[in-house]
Amino acid sequence: TPVVRKGRCSCISTNQGTIHLQSLKDLKQFAPSPSCEKIEIIATLKNGVQTCLNPDSADVKELIKKWEKQVSQKKKQKNGKKHQKKKVLKVRKSQRSRQKKTT
């Protein structure tokens, strides 16, 4: 159960069930800090529920890998779309310059 409070860790308990990648909206990992000396992982599900995950669990480690892979793939897709837009803009610019030259 995540409870964010001053000067203490956020996670009192961790989720008992298995969380599937499809139900994940966000996954945040918090590094150890002066207020909490351990790694904490807080998942936000698509239904809005937030829950703590056990960083020592093999299932959770696997979920993190899958999540990070999914995130990097989405970034690549976004970057790909940006490059495509830039190419289209370049084409349009070159067409305009050609039109000017021909007139």
């Epitope: 159960t1 995540p2 409870v3 409070r5 001053k6 000067g7 203490r8 860790c9 996670c11 009192i12 308990s13 961790t14 989720n15 008992q16 069930g17 909490c36 000396e37 351990k38 529920v49 937030q50 829950t51 703590c52 056990n54 020592d56």
Partner: antibody
Amino acid sequence: QVQLVESGGGVVQPGRSLRLSCAASGFTFSNCGMHWVRQAPGKGLEWVALIGYDGINEYYADSVKGRFTISRDNSKNTLYLQMNSLRAEDTAVFYCARDWPEGYYNGMDVWGQGTTVTVSS
Amino acid sequence: EIVLTQSPGTLSLSPGERATLSCRASQSVSSSYLAWYQQKPGQAPRLLIYGASSRATGIPDRFSGSGSGTDFTLTISRLEPEDFAVYYCQQYGSSPPFTFGPGTKVDIK
């Protein structure tokens, strides 16, 4: 089924020590934060202490800080409360309770039946 | 430390009546961190409401919670004989201690 069973209560003289135990079954103990809550005769509930699921973090009520120590053994599915320098005002029924692990909202969703501690000379 | 005040101290009602119990905090509590418990004589408390308004597993829908900030309410729409008990609110919303209110006793008129 999900169950918490406290033990270790009894009659003890002021200034002496006592250790309470709470045996958990029917759920993944190592995933759950655990609390001790007490209730003096004819009085309301008083939160005493909390330990995180992994035993790293402990929190105490001011009334017991420095005298009581909460601990757990996840390999034995057991929660403990070591009580030192006991006072007459520590006389109460002591309950262990599970912190609800399922989501963002908190609550103690499973309670033991309680064990009675009487501090008297 | 957040102090919780519950009112009234005792509520005398008949079965079938509506019960409205109040819990007031000395400073603002996130609604995510307020719970209600029921306790009958000789028994351990039982979680009724968490997150100010969500019913715990197996709790009948005649129990409902509401409120935010410093004012919270537990309502029992129609009292059943088994509902006569003491009710406690509890806050989780600040650093420990996770205080309980003093309780409201609902007894038979």
